[in-house]
Interface confidence: medium
């Protein structure tokens, strides 16, 4: 399951609640074509990797989160453990997304 993040507080709470689990954040926008393309795959990964927390941030709805996380283009995937960013890449690349999850989980 992918949790939609709607505020900076909700984002911080989700990172805190994750504990030792890997958190994968998809920064996207409704107008972004590549974001739409990879969205179903991102959701399928949330089913495949039940021990990983998947979050979705709409950069227009949560500009403060996107700004704090220094997101410059979409989609951007960021990876967190214990509240710390441990990885990041931009682009709708399915293989790299799953490979990075496997490396960090």
């Amino acid at each position: 399951m992918v949790k939609q993040i709607e505020s900076k507080t909700a984002f911080q709470e989700a990172l805190d609640a994750a504990g030792d689990k890997l958190v994968v954040v998809d920064f996207s926008a409704t107008w972004c074509g590549p974001c739409k393309m990879i969205k179903p795959f991102f959701h399928s990964l949330s089913e495949k990797y039940s021990n990983v927390i998947f979050l979705e941030v709409d950069v227009d709805d949560c500009q403060d989160v996107a700004s704090e996380c220094e997101v410059k283009c979409m989609p951007t995937f960021q990876f967190f453990k214990k509240g710390q960013k441990v990885g990041e890449f931009s682009g709708a690349n399915k293989e790299k997304l799953e490979a990075t999850i496997n490396e960090l989980v």
Epitope: Y49, K94, E95, K96, N102, V105
Partner: antibody, heavy 117, light 105 residues
Framework: EVQLQQSGAELVKPGASVKLSCTAS????????MHWVKQRPEQGLEWIGR????????KYDPKFQGKATITADTSSNTAYLQLSSLTSEDTAVYYC??????????WGQGTSVTVSS | QIVLTQSPAIMSASPGEKVTMTCSAS?????MYWYQQKPGTSPKRWIY???KLASGVPARFSGSGSGTSYSLTISTMEAEDAATYYC????????FGAGTKLELK
Amino acid sequence: EVQLQQSGAELVKPGASVKLSCTASGFNIKDTFMHWVKQRPEQGLEWIGRIDPANGNTKYDPKFQGKATITADTSSNTAYLQLSSLTSEDTAVYYCALLQYSAMDYWGQGTSVTVSS
Amino acid sequence: QIVLTQSPAIMSASPGEKVTMTCSASSRISYMYWYQQKPGTSPKRWIYDTSKLASGVPARFSGSGSGTSYSLTISTMEAEDAATYYCHQRSSYPTFGAGTKLELK
């Protein structure tokens, strides 16, 4: 069509170094991780390590740390494996590979390295 | 690092016979991958995500398992199936099993 073209066979002396290349076509190496795998004669497959060519970030099996160095040149779409202080134990076929999670993944044809005086 | 133990190391089967080989992981893994290799050629992806057949793999092949125990089965052996099969896991540090060499009896 995705292809990985590896450099030719090498005959090298003990103690020397060798640098193998793997040139990709049909995709941009910046979009994925490039892996290297070792196979000694009549033996199994051993993962050496991988590189994320987009940022040069590498990861190695601890067994190959210090022995292998993986680099990439995105302008030529090529990944490299350098092996140092060669011994007879390094005599093997070395494969570059695009190890994917989907149905397809891709391997180079392999480069044979023979260490002999 | 996760160690994969394959058994048997070598086996032989007659055409039409059912073949099963196993791969045991030293720790729990989510998914197993299998490769087929014939002498003088590069390994070929054979099974991915534990049970999905790679493109062009005959339907007589199947994969199963979970946790630490996985297997590859050929329902009816054919001459072209003679090869070495390697199991492979894609955790933080990928590893391969030592292989099962399948010979034609």
